[in-house]
């Protein structure tokens, strides 16, 4: 799986989409985890509706809610109140019993309000530890990035 | 009406390979998963993998993992079950088996082929 | 993977009789996906219920299913000539889709 990457501003919303075969994955509850570490497992965030047929309705936990359309085949999360700490890489998945399929692997970037003049810098990434391999971009505010281009080049 | 129609029976040696298929007609092949069952003479139903014809997505049993390879065609809407090296113990009638779909989700398995009956003799 | 176990393995009975068949899991069957299948001498097996509790196309109402979680039951209600075959419950929750050792519904 390539990564795509979402990038939001600090404080608003965010919307992650994960679009999938609606027939492969037909009956199958969806969810939302973040990865820890390049190796490490993918800690379950937020999961959509017990029962499949009301996947459509949203479901929250704290400021990440889900939502399935199950017809159309895509996943929708939306990270409320974008935070520095939000940052990093999950995974879109599709659930079968108590195993998964990756639809999707995410890389959120968090970029600082325009409108906030604090000294800091202008983006929040994950640690240098965790990987970042054939990553695209799939945002509005965002941009492709080239096979084996470094993401975020060193600034003085 | 959606149909599974299995190839014929099948007498070989053991070492032998083997490719049995079975053709879907009625429906979107592409569109549901396609599954293999095991029946020795005499016993029960045993699940020996599954595939996606849409992408060939496969997933094996852990007893059928190495033993036998999955595969389709989707310009022939056709699925197969194949052996590089049979054995007298893969004697068996052979079914393959459409993932059926509801409203509510997922639907069973339904309809079935008609079963290939697979003889390993020396 | 999620092992199956049906009970009794013969069950012995007069057309007219009711039937009751069970299929515990090892594990939870999340979704019940769970269905149920008969099959008789040289035929391919055929899908009596899915969902634990929803009939299949065709199937008549003398045949229901029932339960949640590890614990499933199949009743035929009025045992008709023809229903005396082999009954097979299956998950198709997680990969492997395991199959129960069957259940035999013979005359008495």
């Known amino acids: 799986h390539n990564t795509t990457v979402f990038q939001g501003v600090e404080g608003q919303s965010l919307q992650v989409s994960c679009p999938y075969d609606s027939m492969k994955h037909w009956g199958r509850r969806k969810a939302w985890c973040r990865q820890l570490g390049e190796k490490g497992p993918c800690q379950r965030v937020v999961s959509t509706h017990n029962l499949w047929l009301l996947s459509f309705l949203r479901r929250r936990n704290g400021s990440t809610a889900i939502t399935d359309d199950t017809l159309g085949g895509t996943l929708t999360i939306t990270l409320r109140n974008l935070q520095p700490h939000d940052a990093g890489f999950y995974q879109c998945q599709s659930l079968h019993g108590s195993e998964a399929d990756t639809l999707r692997k995410v890389l959120v970037e968090v970029l600082a309000d325009p409108l906030d003049h604090r000294d800091a810098g202008d983006l929040w990434v994950p640690g240098e530890s965790e990987s970042f391999e054939d990553a695209h971009v799939e945002h509005s505010i965002s941009r492709s990035l080239l096979e084996g281009e470094i993401p975020f080049p060193p600034t003085s | 009406e959606v149909q599974l129609v299995q190839s014929g029976a099948e007498v070989k040696k053991p070492g032998e390979s083997l490719k049995i298929s079975c053709k879907g007609s009625g429906y979107t092949f592409t569109s549901y998963w396609i599954g293999w069952v095991r029946q020795m003479p005499g016993k029960g139903l045993e699940w020996m993998g599954i595939i996606y014809p849409g992408d060939s997505d496969t997933r094996y049993s852990p007893s059928f993992q190495g033993q036998v390879t999955i595969s389709v065609d989707k310009s022939s809407s056709t699925a197969y079950l194949q052996w590089s090296s049979l054995k007298a113990s893969d004697t068996a009638i052979y079914y393959c088996t459409r993932q059926a779909i509801a409203v509510t989700g997922l639907g069973g398995f339904d309809p079935w082929g008609q079963g290939t009956l697979v003889t390993v003799s020396s | 993977e999620i092992v199956l176990t049906q009970s009794p393995g013969t069950l012995s009975l007069s057309p007219g009789e009711r039937a009751t068949l069970s299929c515990r899991a090892s594990?939870?069957?999340?979704?019940?996906?769970l269905a149920w299948y008969q099959q008789k001498p040289g035929q391919a097996p055929r899908l009596l219920i899915y969902g634990a509790s929803s009939r299949a196309t065709g199937i008549p109402d003398r045949f229901s299913g029932s339960g949640s979680g590890t614990d499933f039951t199949l009743t035929i209600s009025r045992l008709e000539p023809e229903d005396f075959a082999l009954y097979y419950c299956q998950q198709y929750d997680t990969s492997p889709f395991t199959f129960g050792p069957g259940t035999k519904v013979d005359i008495k």
């Open positions: 594990q939870s069957v999340s979704s019940s996906y």
